[in-house]
Interface confidence: medium
Amino acid sequence: EAHKSEIAHRYNDLGEQHFKGLVLIAFSQYLQKCSYDEHAKLVQEVTDFAKTCVADESAANCDKSLHTLFGDKLCAIPNLRENYGELADCCTKQEPERNECFLQHKDDNPSLPPFERPEAEAMCTSFKENPTTFMGHYLHEVARRHPYFYAPELLYYAEQYNEILTQCCAEADKESCLTPKLDGVKEKALVSSVRQRMKCSSMQKFGERAFKAWAVARLSQTFPNADFAEITKLATDLTKVNKECCHGDLLECADDRAELAKYMCENQATISSKLQTCCDKPLLKKAHCLSEVEHDTMPADLPAIAADFVEDQEVCKNYAEAKDVFLGTFLYEYSRRHPDYSVSLLLRLAKKYEATLEKCCAEANPPACYGTVLAEFQPLVEEPKNLVKTNCDLYEKLGEYGFQNAILVRYTQKAPQVSTPTLVEAARNLGRVGTKCCTLPEDQRLPCVEDYLSAILNRVCLLHEKTPVSEHVTKCCSGSLVERRPCFSALTVDETYVPKEFKAETFTFHSDICTLPEKEKQIKKQTALAELVKHKPKATAEQLKTVMDDFAQFLDTCCKAADKDTCFSTEGPNLVTRCKDALA
């Protein structure tokens, strides 16, 4: 239904707190360099304006679109060109081109310092002084570093953050209460960020149809008792919500997500028996809970998939009558039977089925042609299953850090031209798949591993797009989203690469490494490992292990030495010589 004033409508629907949070996220995601104070001022102005429109929908400018109102605010910021360069050119355009222009200037890898957590006492003091400002800072800092973060979900994480601080700041030992809890929230939020970025990439590169197919597969796995029409209704609504968030329409997105959660809770009988616990929660927790609700129990009497999609004499007729609906029912039927498959795999199977029908339905004897299609799925299913087994075995043998190093070597060999920081970030993220997925029950491993890897590789592609340097990476990133992971897995050593010159300074370390937190130490060591592989792409695993063990021993010795500086300056060059010899 149309509203006289869009901004008043959203303010009324969302309430002041969520409205302000979402506007702050929107501004922070568009203009990533502005300070919190600059954005907070704009948010207050927009909120005050929204209140005037609530009081009188006919007041001046209240009938303007949200894009127009927000865009005008952003374009009125002083020194826009000095701070943002060509992004300022967006302000010469009219809506909707202006918003499109802002979207194109979102930076997936902004040059901002890492978000450092203050120590517990200081954090609790500022939280107690002004909880609203404290949470505003959190939203701003996360949103500007993750310009596609799913906004209503970020409000949920801020709420979690708030609850943790409220609880832990009342404890005697604030530090030991806060650290594990906030680390948990941070880890979940980072995974949420890469997953959402993948959804926006799917929408941006391949359109709504591709995202809707993803949603149909995912929802069919989770709600196998819902009928096809119910699944596609949910998929249609979910597509709209994600399209809005990916497009920067955060108020609409959050409002529609709340509506979808309401619909699901009012229609549990036709969706799933597992929703009640989620539906008892308040809004943000409810929507979050529904997004990761456990799979419903599969119906016991499902007929074999072959009955309708291979053996039925009218397969080609049904396909010709309404291709999208027929393929949609195939994806639905296959997915509801396979909660143990990844969404990426299900979409590959649907694509294979479609290609088979396209080919076979044009032949003289279609049934003879498509009769073997399910058998042809076998290699497509075996490939990711083998990937999971191999990688989880390796993770169990090496642990997370060792597993990350194995992946780092593998990926540096596949794409040695990629910058070392990007390779290290990717390997560390890819390596976390072990901790995240390999400890799960067998039937949950494949969906966890492959869908997580796909999201991480999407980030690799986004970073590579900015400065393309590897033909291998370009090739894998140019194809469809669901083929990316198999493409990367299939890459071998890049034979075209000319090894890097050996530079002693790359492997020269100083005593300041000793005081770094464990994570930073690991990154330093992994940076050195990637550089070694770039110097000797064909070094054996044994050679690299020798060098890395020697390196670890060197750090351990010098960090324990009485005179650390002297140790580093005398032993360092010896280490470099030994490394060169070991790799010769």
Epitope: D227, F228, A229, E230, T236, P299, D308, F326, T329, E333
Partner: nanobody
Framework: EVQLLESGGGLVQPGGSLRLSCAAS????????MLWVRQAPGKGLEWVSV????????YYADSVKGRFTISRDNSKNTLYLQMNSLRAEDTAVYYC????????????WGQGTLVTVSS
């Protein structure tokens, strides 16, 4: 007992319009997706259109897309099919059916209403 009663069929000239209705009883209509199917003389059953319990989304066979509109009134337990720009090949017995939990098939259907498109 599930009952579905179609009405509104008849003889119409090519290019003309008809509106079919289907009165439902014996099940919870407002939680059931519904569809229209048709059977042309000497042919097999062909599904025409599906509608979700809430009224959206809707789906159409390619052959009727842009000409037919499915709708429902849950307060009256009634399903509708508005048919415009009718063609000779739309001649068939039209059945309304309750959409099942599985496959593009159907669980229950009525006795049908005949639509004849002829000049």
């Amino acid at each position: 007992e599930v009952q579905l009663l179609e009405s509104g069929g008849g003889l119409v000239q090519p290019g003309g319009s008809l509106r079919l209705s289907c009165a439902a009883s014996g099940f919870t209509f407002d939680t059931s997706s519904m569809l229209w199917v048709r059977q042309a003389p000497g042919k097999g059953l062909e599904w025409v259109s599906v509608i979700h319990q809430s009224g959206t989304p809707t789906y159409y066979a390619d052959s009727v897309k842009g000409r037919f509109t499915i709708s429902r009134d849950n307060s009256k337990n009634t399903l509708y099919l508005q048919m415009n720009s009718l063609r000779a090949e739309d001649t068939a017995v039209y059945y309304c059916a309750k959409f099942p939990s599985s496959r593009m098939k159907f669980d229950y259907w009525g006795q049908g209403t005949l639509v004849t498109v002829s000049s």
